[in-house]
């Protein structure tokens, strides 16, 4: 807005005013009169660009008149008072109200003074983000979905992740006329490493003070990935019990663990305890390949480990894991 004291009477108004669909909005418009300057305002007029006639007029002697009396109101102009504030309130904002408006003061002896204001009709979108639960496909698939519903103008959606991925964004008309629903899919080749990781959907819109961040926890369904731990290649006769653990990562969780050997069932010195296998002390050397088979809803996977129990005295720092 221009600084005061410029000599001429000046109409002050913002260049753009935002309003929300269905709500009311005030288009501010004031006459700035320099000190000592005498001016007389006989009429205030609001007109919309591209339309003939005025939408609102306030006359010094006749008061207000409106093209749509239920939707328009001068907020400060009063009969018998100095007309310096032409601010106009609009009720029940519609999409078609968006556009350029002219606020005009008829002043004497300075002449008519006007300013243009752009009314922006906004609709605040509702935002949701959800995981798209997937299985291992070997192909890029949507793994997360972010939806901004009923925005005007359309919201901007971006994805933030350390995992890579590609967005695929589309728009469709919203439920209310003039609004838009934006859907963005985050696409990646599923892998077990991605399961449980987070991606963030960022939604930006004129109506937001700051971007909205929605976090999605990724879900990849995959069969068990199995390994056996607890053996260090230094097991000797006469040592204490040792424990092997069948380590399984899977989604959903494993439903069963089955221990066996390549020769068939477990030997007497090996006792299965769910995911663990207890190896009791033995009195003669062993060379056996153990198998752990893990099952979940998507299938079964197994790991093998060849265990040797050797002759010879164990040193202090070697041997099987002790209880």
């Amino acid at each position: 807005w221009p600084p005061p004291g410029t000599g001429d009477v000046v109409v002050q108004a913002p260049t753009q005013v935002p309003g929300f669909l269905g709500d009311s909005v005030t288009l501010p418009c004031y006459l700035q009169v320099p000190n000592m300057e005498v001016t007389h305002v006989s009429q205030l007029t609001w007109a919309r660009h591209g339309e003939s006639g005025s939408m609102a007029v306030f006359h010094q002697t006749q008061g207000p008149s409106y093209s749509e009396s239920k939707r328009l109101e001068f907020v400060a102009a009063r009969l018998g008072a100095e007309l310096r504030n032409a601010s106009l309130r609009m009720f029940g904002l519609r999409v078609e109200d968006e556009g350029n408006y002219t606020c005009l003061f008829v002043t004497f002896p300075q002449g008519s003074r006007s300013v243009d204001i752009w009314l922006r009709v906004l609709a605040k979108p509702q935002n949701t983000a959800e995981v798209q639960k997937v299985q291992l496909t070997g192909e890029p698939v949507p793994m997360a979905r972010c939806v901004s519903t009923g925005g005007r103008p359309p919201a901007q959606i971006t994805w933030h992740s350390d995992l890579g991925g590609m967005p695929n964004t589309s728009q469709v008309p919203g439920f209310l006329s003039g609004t838009v629903t934006v859907t963005s899919l985050w696409i990646l080749v599923p892998s077990s490493q991605v399961d449980g990781k987070n991606v963030t959907c960022k939604v930006e819109h004129e109506s937001f003070e700051k971007p909205q961040l929605l976090t999605v926890n990724l879900t990849v369904y995959y069969p068990p990935e199995v390994s056996i731990s607890g053996y260090d290649n230094n097991w000797y006769l006469g040592q204490n019990e040792a424990t092997l653990t069948c380590d399984a990562r899977s989604n959903p969780e494993p439903t069963g663990y089955n221990w066996s050997t390549t020769m068939g069932p477990l030997p007497p010195f090996a006792v299965a305890q769910g995911a663990q296998l207890l190896i009791r002390p033995v009195d003669k050397p062993i060379n056996t390949t153990l198998i752990c088979n893990v099952t979940n809803a998507l299938g079964a996977r197994q790991a093998e480990l060849t265990v040797q129990v050797k002759e010879g005295p164990p040193s202090e720092h070697s041997g099987i894991s002790r209880n």
Epitope: D8, M36, V38, H40, S42, Q60, G80, Q110
Partner: antibody
Framework: QVQLVQSGAEVKKPGASVKVSCKAS????????ISWVRQAPGQGLEWIAW????????NYNQKFTGRVTMTTDTSTSTAYMELRSLRSDDTAVYYC??????????????WGQGTTVTVSS | QAVVTQEPSLTVSPGGTVTLTCRSS?????????ANWVQQKPGQAFRGLIG???NRAPGVPARFSGSLLGDKAALTLSGAQPEDEAEYYC?????????FGGGTKLTVL
């Protein structure tokens, strides 16, 4: 057409008052600004005041404040200027002038024929 | 009060161009003085020509134009006609009152 018809010539003694009328026709009187201007013999023009006919809002030249009163009668579309405590240097032709608007600016559009006021003892 | 000064008289040939000026004793004339120009032909009523520095009144021939010229208001007559012979007054607005100039007698000869 737009016309301003003023009252006839006046001869007044010093200290007296005079009230000059200006009857408008051909336009919406209540939406108009009317200025009063005078021209002393052999002199240029001197602006006295303006009035907004619709409300009676006025703005006076400080030189005349306290001695001049402008009024309107909207029922007869007539503007009045009363000048009190007349002196000999108030002898002049008094004009009413309606201001017209070009949209961006105002101008002295239509003038009355003038009323001669003579102040003489 | 401010004093507004005009050329007492100017002469222009028919078809010629002449510029009448209006100077303010308070300094440069600006658009905030809303310069007005008024014409008075002998034996006729006054007639407004220009308002707000450069806005021509309806019905006024295009040969009349108002402007600011340096630190003065100006009325330029391009292609003068014999019927333009008249007295021309300017009026300037000073925040709360108008001040008229002494007038310029324009002769078309």
């Amino acid at each position: 057409q737009v016309q301003l018809v003023q009252s006839g010539a006046e001869v007044k003694k010093p200290g007296a008052s005079v009230k000059v009328s200006c009857k408008a026709s051909g336009y919406t009187f209540t939406s108009s600004y009317i200025s009063w201007v005078r021209q002393a013999p052999g002199q240029g023009l001197e602006w006295i005041a303006w009035i907004y006919a619709g409300t009676g809002d006025t703005n006076y030249n400080q030189k005349f404040t306290g001695r001049v009163t402008m009024t309107t009668d909207t029922s007869t579309s007539t503007a009045y200027m009363e000048l009190r405590s007349l002196r000999s240097d108030d002898t002049a032709v008094y004009y009413c002038a309606r201001h017209g608007s070009t949209g961006r600016g105002w101008y002295f559009a239509v003038w009355g024929q003038g009323t001669t006021v003579t102040v003489s003892s | 009060q401010a004093v507004v000064t005009q050329e007492p008289s100017l002469t222009v040939s028919p078809g010629g161009t002449v510029t009448l000026t209006c100077r303010s004793s308070t300094g440069a004339v600006t658009t905030s003085n809303y310069a007005n120009w008024v014409q008075q032909k002998p034996g006729q009523a006054f007639r407004g020509l220009i308002g707000g520095t450069n806005n021509r009144a309806p019905g006024v021939p295009a040969r009349f134009s108002g402007s600011l010229l340096g630190d003065k208001a100006a009325l330029t007559l391009s292609g003068a006609q014999p019927e333009d012979e008249a007295e021309y007054y300017c009026a300037l607005w000073y925040s709360n009152h108008f001040v008229f100039g002494g007038g310029t007698k324009l002769t078309v000869l």
